[in-house]
């Protein structure tokens, strides 16, 4: 029998200082461009080396921004994603939502790590 | 670095069927969107049609429902299916792999490009 993959999803806030690269990783995603069908979420692409959010740590490949400096990131076009990151000044705060694979067991039996029930 | 490699170029009638295959290796990210463009003589390079690595689909207007973008995340490749070709699909079609707008000093469109395959639609 094969396993369930599920998600663990965890909301974090992350505070990043801008680097001499900037705040050192990509995005993809926005209403003209969606990553994901039917979500027009903004999602980490990569994490340059050596920059600000390697540095940290925290941030990881795959994680939904949610927020830059509390303004909401829904709904909005790439570029306009874009410039808001570009105007937020030198303190960079960032609600994540990060997207765990949690490997549950054979279907119909209940793993340890399942929380249902 | 990133390398790609198109194949699957050639001189069809209209009317007739391609399918453009793109490889790609190097250090690509496991987030990423891959696509296909195009450029006639004397035209702009344009978007023809791009996948992402979460599943969303892109086309142009003017191939919608004659080609289909599909691709394989286990081999780093994307493929496009073009049925129906007319005379005005002739161009050199670029693959492209985009990982996304880097916010650095920049803020530039983070992507690489095939050396392109040429069809003909006689």
């Known amino acids: 029998m094969n396993g369930r993959v599920d998600y663990l999803v965890t909301e974090e806030e992350i505070n990043l200082t801008r680097g001499p690269s900037g705040l050192g990783f990509n995005i993809v995603g926005g209403t003209d461009q969606q990553y994901v069908s039917n979500d027009s979420g903004i999602y980490v692409s990569r994490i340059k080396e050596n920059g600000a959010a390697a540095l940290d740590g925290r941030l990881q490949e795959g994680d939904k921004i949610l927020s830059v400096n509390g303004q909401d990131l829904k709904n909005l076009l790439h570029q306009d994603a874009v410039d808001l990151f570009r105007n937020a000044g030198y303190a960079v705060s960032l609600r994540v939502q990060h997207r765990l694979q949690v490997q549950n067991g054979p279907i119909g039996h209940r793993g340890e790590g399942d929380p249902s029930g | 670095d990133v390398q790609l490699v198109e194949s699957g170029g050639g001189l069809v009638q209209a009317g007739g069927s391609l399918r453009l295959s793109c490889a790609a290796s190097?250090?690509?990210?496991?987030?990423?969107?891959m696509g296909w463009y195009r450029q006639a003589p004397g035209k702009q390079r344009e978007l023809v049609a791009s996948?992402?690595?979460?599943?969303?689909?892109n086309y142009a207007d003017s191939v919608k429902g004659r080609f289909t973008i599909s691709r394989d995340n286990a081999k780093n490749a994307v493929y496009l299916q073009m049925n129906s070709l007319k005379p005005e699909d002739t161009a050199v079609y670029y693959c492209?792999?985009?990982?996304?707008?880097?916010?650095?000093?920049?803020?530039?469109?983070?992507?690489?490009w095939g050396r392109g395959t040429q069809v003909t639609v006689s």
């Open positions: 492209n792999l985009a990982r996304g707008t880097h916010l650095g000093d920049s803020f530039e469109r983070d992507d690489y």
């Open positions: 190097g250090s690509i990210g496991s987030i990423n969107i």
């Open positions: 996948i992402t690595s979460g599943g969303a689909t």
